[in-house]
């Protein structure tokens, strides 16, 4: 089955630059297909632009302007790229690749989406790092002790832009595990958000990350944010494993003697 | 040119009662067309749901029916036992491929319909309340209430700044809700809420314990400790980024 | 200081043509979205056209649609608005506005020029 | 096609509070704009994106957006504030401006 996946979740401009978006397919050959972009203005409803089929050629969407969307495919990576030149304000949206995917059943077809890239604009200059800056909440012992249940909380703070992914896995998994999440707020030029995980007692003592994906993530890979195993019985880490580290991989854990 | 109308912007529902979604064709007969529909989810992950000839997205089938109305021009989804899973903006879309002749690949889509979900209606449920700390951040983490109105109140003399609670919708079908704010006094800090005329206080779930339970650390004392695994993630947190863990005793 | 100075209105006859433009300055023109807007005598007002700031997109009132044409010369810091087969019901003033929101997806107008009238009539 | 709704007129006397309101489908999601207009003179904009103000306009103006409702609110209302009061949004590739209210200072 093909499967799309747009690496930015969101991709910041200023005014006239050339935004590059990307789509990366994969289960099926990207040359034995065609791949096609829509956008989704704010209050508009989503709209085809440019195709390119699986012989190179491409395909643009009546109205569009001519010279501000380019399309083309990278086998190789099997990769599309939709550019966006001279970026201007109306450009703002999100932007999905899409491909029409084969069915089991002979003659069955159905257009997959990719999860969207968002394309922002701006005309301030903002710090030099508003990637999200990591709080963590361990459960406390009162939900603990009386729930038979702990609930961990990531909160996110100082990011630009708005645009951000939580999501919870435990350690050596990789599912992903159900969790909540408040909205994203502003706080002056830049966002919050919080997500939190309640986990049943006996998942306790197993260590879970938060991993947050945001375009200003350093080194533009997901975050992983470690949330350590909890006793029940005694509130401490867990010592088990004792793999040296460098200094700055630490975590400084501050243990406080505070209530509920 | 054709235009795919949602019957309504919004659509409430509550877990467990059938829905019906519509979207209506303007400027052309539907049946010229295959109808589509998907469902927008939070971070904007846009999932296949349906397409004519009886073809469902993985998942959908047990749950959704899709209809055509060639009589009214319209386009039917049902959603039939509804769960907080299926809140989103759902959307009708259309296309003519593999009908032979003029036909067109992409597709055309109508405006989204918000789907917002509700509890059911059920026995009012008091909350439990529980308040995490880090640093100078406080979470009051408010579990299990019905109905929905709550007042979340993190109480202390030095606040530095709060934020709107997130209410949503628990695995079991009540609400949960997460207040967090910032306070020079964090240690001090309680959290109580006002439900169904009632009060309710982080204090009243204070679990006494005897002092072997449970390490107590020294007031001040900070330690330095290894990662737990020697795996590498993909990002390391720098302690700067970490505003340090808390564990509270 | 930020102005905007229109001009090119006056009495046409139905069916005729005319050609507004409107002279930007106090400001750098090119990154903002412009705009005209038209009140008829005594009455409210009514958006007309929007051009984005690279001329990529342009945006009329189903009122115009078909007749008029707006257009943009950057270096010039002017902004124009082509008018034919004009009619009665086109009669206003005609204002030239700068779109004050330069990278969101909202629109308002924060400088308006002094307006320029233009009758149709016979 | 979208619509803006105004009451044509609204009195208040010196030093009270005036309200002019603006209704339409989904208004909250749109971020709402005020024009003051004068007589002669050309729109001046006092409120936009529901609550903001331009450098230079008093503080007794404010503005407030929920729902399909935004608000105008000026309080302390003087006599120079008497004008017409337009609501704009902006809907898909569309501005679209409300019928005006005109204010008059009693």
């Known amino acids: 089955a093909g499967h799309l996946e747009q690496p930015q979740i969101s991709s910041t401009k200023t005014l006239s630059k050339t935004a590059r978006l990307e789509c990366v397919v994969s289960g099926i050959t990207i040359s034995a297909t065609s791949v096609y972009w829509y956008r989704e203005r704010p209050g508009e409803v989503i709209q085809f632009l440019v195709s390119i089929s699986y012989d190179g050629t491409v395909r643009k969407e009546s109205g569009i302007p001519s010279g501000k969307f380019e399309v083309d495919r990278i086998p190789e990576t099997s990769t599309s790229t939709l550019t966006i030149h001279n970026v201007e304000k109306q450009d703002i949206a999100t932007y999905y690749c899409a491909l029409w995917e084969a069915q089991q059943e002979l003659g069955k077809k159905i257009k997959v989406f990719g999860p969207g890239t968002k394309l922002i604009i701006t005309d301030k200059q903002l710090d030099a790092d508003v990637s999200p800056k990591p709080t963590i909440f361990l459960p406390s012992i009162a939900e603990t002790k009386l729930q038979k249940a702990g609930t961990y909380l990531c909160l996110l703070e100082k990011f630009f832009p708005d645009v951000i992914k939580i999501h919870w896995q435990e350690k050596k998994s990789n599912t992903i595990l159900g969790s909540q999440e408040g909205n994203t707020m502003k706080t002056n030029d830049t966002y919050m958000k919080f997500s939190w995980l309640t986990v049943p007692e006996k998942s306790l003592d197993k260590e879970h990350r938060c991993i947050v994906r945001h375009e200003n993530n350093k080194n533009g890979v997901d975050q992983e944010i470690i949330f350590p195993p909890i006793k029940t019985d005694v509130i401490t880490m867990d010592p088990k494993d004792n793999c040296s580290k460098d200094a700055n991989d630490t975590l400084l854990l501050q243990l406080t003697n505070t209530s509920a | 040119a054709i235009e795919l109308v949602p019957e309504h912007q919004t659509v409430p529902v509550s877990i467990g009662v059938p829905a019906t979604l519509r979207c209506s064709m303007k400027g052309e007969a539907i049946g010229n067309y295959y109808i589509n529909w998907y469902r927008k989810t939070q971070g904007n992950t846009m999932t296949f749901i349906y397409r004519e000839k009886d073809i469902y997205g993985p998942g959908f089938k047990d749950n959704f029916q899709g209809d055509i109305d060639i009589a009214k021009n319209l386009a039917v989804l049902k959603i039939l036992a509804p769960s907080e899973r299926d809140e989103g903006s759902y959307y009708c879309a259309c296309d003519t491929l593999g009908m032979g002749g003029e036909y067109t690949d992409k597709l055309i889509f109508g405006k989204g319909t918000r789907v917002t979900v509700e509890p059911r209606s059920q026995p009012h449920t008091k909350p439990s309340v529980f308040v995490m700390k880090n640093g100078t951040n406080v979470a009051c983490l408010v579990k299990e209430f019905y109905p929905k109105d709550i007042r979340i109140n993190l109480v202390s003399s030095k606040k530095i700044t709060e934020f709107d609670p997130a209410i949503v919708i628990s695995p079991s079908g009540k609400y949960n809700a997460v207040k967090l704010g910032k306070y020079e006094d964090s240690n001090s800090v309680t959290c109580s809420v006002q439900h169904d005329n009632k009060t309710v206080h982080s204090t009243d779930f204070e679990v006494k314990t005897d002092s072997t339970d449970h390490v107590k650390p020294k007031e001040t004392e900070n330690t330095k400790q290894p990662s737990k695994s020697c795996h590498k993630p993909k990002a390391i947190v720098h302690t700067e980024k970490v505003n340090m863990m808390s564990l509270t005793v | 200081e930020v102005q905007l100075v229109e001009s090119g209105g006056g009495l046409v006859k139905p069916g005729g043509s005319l050609r507004l433009s409107c002279a930007a300055s106090?400001?750098?023109?090119?990154?903002?979205?412009m705009n005209w807007v038209r009140q008829a005598p005594g009455k409210g007002l009514e958006w007309v056209s929007s051009?984005?700031?690279?001329?990529?997109?342009?945006y009329y009132a189903d009122s115009v649609k078909g007749r008029f044409t707006i257009s943009r010369d950057n270096a010039k810091n002017s902004l124009y608005l082509q008018m034919n087969s004009l009619r009665a019901e086109d009669t206003a003033v005609y204002y030239c506005a700068r779109d004050g929101d330069l990278v969101g997806p909202t629109y308002y107008f924060d400088y308006w020029g002094q307006g320029t009238l233009v009758t149709v009539s016979s | 096609s979208y619509e803006l709704m105004q009451p044509p007129s609204v009195s208040v006397s010196p030093g009270q509070t005036a309200s002019i309101t603006c209704s339409g489908d989904k208004l909250g999601d749109k971020y709402a704009c005020w024009y003051q207009q004068k007589p002669g003179q050309s729109p001046v904009l006092v409120i936009y994106q529901h609550n903001k103000r331009p450098s230079g306009i008093p503080e007794r103006f404010s503005g407030s957006n929920s729902g399909k409702t935004a608000t105008l609110t000026i309080s302390g209302t003087q006599a120079m504030d008497e004008a017409d009061y337009y609501c704009q949004a902006w809907d898909s590739t569309t501005v679209v401006f409300g019928g005006g209210t005109k204010l008059t200072v009693l």
């Open positions: 106090g400001f750098t023109f090119s990154p903002y979205t």
């Open positions: 051009i984005s700031s690279s001329s990529s997109y342009m």
